[in-house]
């Protein structure tokens, strides 16, 4: 037996991080996103839960809604009506899936200083929102959409087809919520509040995933979710638009699907209002390499929405799937005809293009061996976007302004030189026409949020600088973080290495690889974090590495689409390549290398452990996918095609974790899953376990009863990280 090793950070008054610090969230940071209500006004919820109004120009601020009013209904969120007469207060938050939740809503009349009585809202509500002007309300209750002209009015029921687990109006079903829309809603007001567009999802023919929820009762209850796995029947989707001022006159009008899309299975992917009578819909073939953007206009004479063929714009990928993780959405110009959109250029890098008439005639606005990530705002004279261009680091985000009024357009990096060491990863929040904006910097130093003038980019004030966190970290020994690249053959892999305090290159350290590796993901980011792996480096002296292999995002389509139709191959290969390179660096103890990951990372870590290379001593898979046939259709098929003989069934079968069960014999494997995982079903781990048992391979396992994909309840999370820590320390012969 090898003697146990204890890592002791040398002579320093600072203390190491403890696991308790991490589990208690002691070193969590704050961000500040203004809730914009005009060009120069915003709301923000204060530390003590008052809702405070701010006017940037007059510098006035006052409480518009007191914490006592919030507390009177136990409100945790709020929304001001655009006419500023009412506020909805949200309470009884009850989480459903990743984005969805139900809640109770109360309407507070700011003018009268009292809650609106009469025609009170039903409960629980699945979604509620104000119209963009005035104080109309749209809400979804029991899968149907309702409208209120004013908060105290009787409701008007727009849809009647809603039925639990069958038909969803105005809210997505499970698969659309998780894999397509990434929202809890599927309804959109027109800019003037006249029309309401919504989606109807018909899940009647979708197979059901059923799992037990144990609760406290004598009998478990069964959770049933219509969940299309790869190759299964998908939701049938229809888009409607209703005139909310006079909904009875015509009733909801269906928006036609483009012919080239409707000819086979398809998805609705997003809706963007262009003007009060023009709407843009995006559709996607089930084989997700063809996307169609369709611009539709209201025809008063027909009482219908017309989507002419010459207003259909096709986006197609010949090397993989359309878009990044999702197909990008258009940012329309003031003319309500032309728009800016991010898609791959001829070199396979995602860049901003300007489309005036056809995609073929698109004008490329940005270019280079980097990628445009997101278009924040298009105004009369400026376009604001984020990219990873600066200094060639894919894991950074800076905000740029292109002056589109100028010819040729001029580009300026707004954030590159603001706080160069502290801030290399930004997002932004703009007022309506970008007169002002907030920058939120996520790192690599302490996060900081600042307010800026939209014309001059001048910093007006610091909104949040995390001073308390800075103070509390003064006596903590944080690890050193490096972001570098390594080369192998013609490939370049970016990695992040977290090195223990007083790291000494001449010594040998255990290595833990943290992997996610899913298509279009990114792990190597210049962001601040104090989490479990920070603790492992700080206290336990473990070197941590994260590597972005092929299939990860923002480095061009050649790198991204390498994994197309063959998931589970290059993602794993590139982690192994990186480990070999790390060993060559000389400070890694080859006998003590582990890998861990969650979700897609659990899949990759499992396959890496079963690679037969002997590189890993042990590893952990939390909530892993074990076969792409078990996962959602929209996700699996985007990257793998269909699990049919004439398509890609063969690779579906040979990319499973179960197929490699024999190869786990020489590693210590810890398999963990929540039994109430609605996303990556417990079935995945159950099948791995069955295959390992059948192969007579010993392994460790832990399940978390009634926990979902996040295993996020306080007690479970504490148990999970404590358990994984013990497993790792045992693997690395580190004493407790």
């Amino acid at each position: 037996l090898r003697p146990s090793r204890v890592y002791k950070p040398e002579g320093n008054t600072k203390r190491a991080l403890t696991l308790k610090d991490i589990l208690n969230g002691t070193f969590s940071y704050k961000t500040y996103f203004p809730n914009w209500i005009s060009e120069q006004e915003y709301l923000h919820q204060s530390e003590d839960d008052n809702i405070v109004f701010y006017n940037i120009e007059t510098r006035e601020s006052y409480i518009i809604l007191s914490n006592s009013t919030m507390k009177s209904v136990n409100a945790t969120d709020y929304g001001l009506s655009p006419d500023r007469q009412f506020v909805y207060l949200e309470s009884d938050y009850s989480k459903l899936w990743r984005y969805s939740y139900t809640a109770t809503y109360y309407i507070y009349d700011l003018q009268n200083g009292e809650f609106v009585r009469g025609y009170e809202l039903p409960r629980p509500i699945q979604y509620l929102c104000w119209s963009p002007v005035g104080s109309k309300l749209a809400y979804v209750y029991q899968n149907n959409i309702y409208l209120k002209q004013r908060p105290g009015d009787p409701p008007f029921q727009i849809t009647y087809t809603g039925r639990e687990n069958r038909i969803f109006n105005g809210i997505p079903d499970w698969v659309y919520e998780e894999e397509m829309l990434a929202t809890k809603y599927a309804l959109w007001w027109s800019p003037d509040g006249k029309f309401l567009a919504y989606v109807e999802f018909n899940d009647s023919d979708i197979p059901i995933i059923a799992y037990s929820y144990y609760g406290d009762g004598q009998y478990p209850r069964t959770i049933n979710i219509p969940y299309p796995k790869a190759g299964a029947k998908n939701p049938v989707v229809r888009v409607f638009i209703v005139d909310t001022t006079y909904p009875h006159h015509v009733g909801p009008m269906e928006v036609p699907v483009p012919e080239m899309i409707a000819s086979s299975d398809y998805y609705f992917s997003w809706l963007t209002w262009v003007s009060s009578e023009r709407v843009c819909l995006q559709w996607l073939k089930r084989v997700q390499n063809v996307s169609v953007l369709s611009i539709c206009d209201f025809r008063e004479d027909w009482h219908a929405w017309e989507c002419p063929k010459n207003q259909e714009h096709v986006e197609e990928s010949r090397t993989g799937w359309a878009g990044g993780f999702f197909v990008s959405t258009p940012a329309f110009s003031q003319d309500a005809t032309s728009y800016y959109k991010i898609f791959s250029d001829k070199d396979g890098y995602k860049h901003i293009h300007y489309i005036k008439d056809t995609v073929e005639n698109a004008i490329q606005i940005t270019s280079g061996k980097w990628e445009a990530i997101y278009i924040f705002r298009v105004t009369q004279d400026s376009l604001f976007y984020s990219s990873n261009e600066f200094e060639g680091y894919p894991g950074r985000r800076n905000i740029y302004r292109i002056s589109i009024g100028n010819s040729p357009p001029s580009k300026k990096c707004v954030t590159c030189h603001l706080r160069k060491e502290r801030c290399q990863y930004y997002t932004a929040s703009f007022s309506y026409k970008a007169k002002y904006y907030a920058l939120v910097c996520y790192g690599p130093g302490l996060p900081i949020s600042t307010l800026h003038d939209g014309r001059t980019d001048q910093e007006i004030q610091v909104l949040e600088e995390n001073k308390e966190l800075e103070n509390s970290l003064r006596n903590i020994q944080l690890p050193k973080v490096e972001i570098k690249k390594l080369k192998d053959g013609g490939l370049t892999f970016w990695y992040k290495m977290i090195l223990p305090p007083q790291f000494d290159r001449s010594k040998k350290y255990p290595l833990l690889i943290q992997v996610y590796g899913g298509p279009c993901s990114q792990s190597v980011k210049s962001v601040f974090a104090v989490n479990w792996i920070t603790y492992l480096a700080s206290k336990e002296g473990i070197v941590i590495a994260l590597v972005d292999g092929r299939g990860t995002a923002f480095q061009g389509d050649k790198f991204l689409h390498a994994v197309y139709r063959k998931l589970g191959v290059y993602e794993v290969e590139d982690q192994l390549t990186a480990v070999r390179k790390f060993i060559e660096m000389g400070f890694i103890d080859e006998e003590r290398i582990a890998i861990w990951g969650w979700s897609y990372g659990g899949y990759v870590s499992s396959l890496a452990l079963a690679s037969g290379t002997g590189l890993f001593k042990c590893g952990i898979a939390v909530a892993p996918v074990s076969s792409w046939e078990y996962y959602a259709s929209i996700y699996s098929e985007r990257f793998m095609g269909l699990p049919t003989k004439d398509d890609n069934l063969e690779h579906y079968k040979n990319s499973t974790v179960m197929a490699r069960a024999e190869y786990f014999r020489n590693v210590d494997y810890l398999l963990i899953h929540g039994t109430a995982d609605d996303n990556v079903h417990f079935q995945n781990s159950a099948q791995i376990a069955k295959a390992l048992v059948n192969a007579q391979v010993d392994f460790q396992a832990m399940w978390y009863s009634d926990q979902n994909h996040g295993i996020s309840s306080g007690r479970s999370q504490n148990h999970l990280y404590t358990h994984m820590t013990h497993f790792l320390k045992q693997c690395f012969s580190l004493s407790d």
Epitope: K136, L147, Q149, R150, F156, Y246, H248
Partner: antibody, heavy 118, light 108 residues
Amino acid sequence: EVQLLESGGGLVQPGGSLRLSCAASGFTFKSYVMSWVRQAPGKGLEWVSAIVPSGGDTYYADSVKGRFTISRDNSKNTLYLQMNSLRAEDTAVYYCAKDYYGGWFDPWGQGTLVTVSS
Amino acid sequence: EIVLTQSPGTLSLSPGERATLSCRASQSVSSSYLAWYQQKPGQAPRLLIYGASSRATGIPDRFSGSGSGTDFTLTISRLEPEDFAVYYCQQYGSSPRTFGQGTKVEIK
């Protein structure tokens, strides 16, 4: 309290014109569809016309199309009904009503009587 | 247009009794888009029910509506003296909106 007050009714000869007004108070007038509904003496109710909040769209019963014009002035919180080419069968009490979603009516004004007779 | 026929034309009942008023449509009223009103002599109509069964604000719970398709009912569970009036049904499921001819509930 919501109040609707009609005025402008009276006796008019066939072929003549009349303009009805409805003054609204106690609610955000500019947010609502508004309608006129009439009731001939001793008879039932008949919807006449409706107008959307912006005034941009108007709707009429076939029996009055081309003769009546509904309009509104949101700055004055007032609804109007211009009645031209009046006929004996237009004789009725005319009510203005807050119109929910182009559906039901609530509340109604007290009504104004229009008598078309020679 | 949809024609609404109310029956009976007149209903003679005593206070405390149950009143059942019927409204039949010439064709199906989509999504139960039907309202009921009460009108007393010399007064404007007053909304009782919308959406076939939803009570308007301030309306006592002795008033209830039911039905769908072509057959709708207004029920007054126990007649109070102030309930004696004319009752109208109105459909708003298709254009133009139309009313029934009314049912008069009188004291027996």
